[in-house]
Interface confidence: low
């Protein structure tokens, strides 16, 4: 988890939530400022701190760096997905570095919803579901704490290469699962190797390549509900010639256009006065 | 222009053999699973065999298995049915067809099919 | 294997009336279902795919519907070119199956 990626883990250190590429974040609601030589807001800013401290340590940690790098804004756009998305995550928080807002802080026992956006970057996939090293994409991981939350939205976001001319491109995505004895056609008996759960007719006029979401609500529910049943998806995406215009190569050369999936999630929290 | 031509049938007595042959054009003949579907006189359709788009992989009807062979020479982009100890219940227009996807040879339907050819046998 | 029925095995319609055809799977094959047309002395030519998708080319008075085990093909309005056989064929389950066939012929 070294180099670029890692640098970019670390600059949304701030935003980062769970673990395997799961990245999340959410706006802070502006609250008024506290009135000078109050003690309790004194502890809640030092609390905060260490807090921080502690989030930022964990990240750190798990990317094997020693210290956040120092990274700009332009630097943290280059590295992260070239994608809608992100990018409006990105404008929507100003992204300054590490810079954090100040948190929110409840009356007692008042429940309170916030909704936020989960990030998940594609992963290599297991090897019980690969044939000959393939496919090597796409894994999704998600932690404990957004598969406990209400999905509102899932989003599976793909990358298509562009094309010369315009072009009819058929979208497949397949559900892998573990190959377990001899395979049939058409899918049948023990060996099914992968089940089909979407498939879409894309017009491409683009030259310059396409950003293309798929609904994934559904299947991220089946996924949170069953969490070993997520062996990770074949993404195909075939022109009339039978050429794969998909981006799931996980290697170098195709940085910031691997598949992702962006989560809306509704966490209810209940906080109470410390 | 997808396109696939198919040569070989003819009359055969039972027992016989026979081979038909499918070429293919207009598309990356290599990236794609194939299968074979044939059509008994006045009657339904009925899918016989598959072949993954590499060749490692083949797949038969119960009513062929064992007689009948798929298999495809992705350098000369042709697709073949060997058939071996024919049955009069094996007349019918044999078509090859293209699988829709690439890949493997699950859950697919067919696009684009050959023209078909007849395959007799009859003592 | 999944049996596939298909009814009524012949539709007597004319020009520019609704066609209904169609198409119930021995078990569930969810979405997993063609449709082609075959014309005499042709092959077929694929028209519906998993289910409700039309294929390229393939005219908008075509439409399929269902899911599970029920399927329906429509034709909203019959021009001459569209009498002919129409098979569904389902690929949830090996063996890859299709069903008898509906003659849709000139009344």
């Known amino acids: 988890a070294e180099g670029p990626a890692a640098a970019a883990a670390a600059a949304a250190a701030a935003a980062a939530a769970g673990v395997g590429g799961e990245r999340s974040s959410r706006p802070a609601p502006s609250v008024a400022p506290e009135p000078d030589g109050c003690p309790v807001c004194v502890w809640r800013q030092h609390s905060r701190e260490l807090r921080l401290e502690s989030i930022k340590s964990q990240i750190l940690s798990k990317l094997r760096l020693k210290e956040a790098p120092n990274i700009s804004r332009e630097v943290v756009k280059q590295l992260l997905p070239k994608a809608p998305p992100l990018q409006q995550i990105l404008d929507l928080h100003d992204f300054q570095g590490d810079a954090l807002q100040p948190e929110d802080f409840l009356e007692e026992d008042e429940y309170h919803a916030t909704t936020e956006t989960v990030i998940s970057m594609a992963q290599e996939t297991d090897p019980a579901v690969q044939t000959d090293g393939s496919p090597l994409c796409c894994h999704f991981h998600f932690s404990p704490k957004v598969m406990f939350t209400k999905v509102l939205k899932a989003q599976l976001w793909v990358y298509l290469r562009p094309v010369p001319r315009p072009a009819t491109v058929y979208l497949q995505i397949l559900r892998l699962k573990p190959l377990t004895g001899e395979g049939t056609a058409g899918g049948g008996g023990g060996g099914r190797r992968h089940i089909r759960i979407r498939s879409l007719k894309i017009e491409l006029h683009s030259r310059s390549g396409h950003w293309q979401s798929i609904d994934f609500k559904q299947v991220l529910h089946s996924w949170f509900r069953q969490p070993q049943s997520n062996w990770g998806i074949e993404i195909n995406a075939f022109d009339p010639s039978g050429t794969d215009l998909a981006v799931t190569s996980l290697g170098p050369g195709a940085e910031g256009l691997h598949p992702f999936m962006e989560l809306r999630v509704l966490e209810n929290t209940k906080r109470s006065r410390r | 222009q997808v396109q696939l031509v198919q040569s070989g049938g003819g009359v055969v007595q039972p027992g016989r053999s026979l081979r038909l042959s499918c070429a293919a054009s207009?598309?990356?003949?290599?990236?794609?699973?194939m299968h074979w579907v044939r059509q008994a006189p006045g009657k339904g359709l009925e899918w016989v065999a598959v072949?993954?788009?590499?060749?490692?992989?083949?797949y038969y009807a119960d009513s062929v298995k064992g007689r009948f062979t798929i298999s495809r020479d992705n350098s000369k982009n042709t697709l073949y049915l060997q058939m071996n100890s024919l049955r009069a219940e094996d007349t019918a227009v044999y078509y090859c067809?293209?699988?829709?996807?690439?890949?493997?040879?699950?859950?697919?339907?067919?696009?684009?099919w050959g023209q078909g050819t007849l395959v007799t046998v009859s003592s | 294997e999944i049996v596939m029925t298909q009814s009524p095995a012949t539709l007597s319609l004319s020009a520019g009336e609704r066609a209904t055809l169609s198409c119930r799977a021995s078990?569930?094959?969810?979405?997993?279902l063609a449709w082609y047309q075959q014309k005499p002395g042709q092959a077929p030519r694929l028209l519906i795919y998993?289910?409700?998708n039309r294929a390229t080319g393939i005219p908008a008075r075509f439409s399929g519907s269902g899911s599970g085990t029920d399927f329906t093909l429509t034709i909203s309005s019959l021009e001459p070119e569209d009498f002919a056989v129409y098979y569904c064929?389902?690929?949830?389950?090996?063996?890859?199956?299709f069903g008898g066939g509906t003659n849709v012929e000139i009344k």
């Open positions: 998993d289910a409700s």
């Open positions: 067809a293209k699988d829709f996807w690439s890949g493997y040879p699950q859950y697919n339907w067919f696009d684009p």
């Open positions: 078990q569930s094959v969810s979405n997993y």
């Open positions: 064929q389902q690929y949830g389950s090996a063996p890859l199956t």
């Open positions: 072949i993954s788009y590499d060749g490692s992989n083949e």
């Open positions: 207009g598309f990356t003949f290599s990236s794609y699973a």
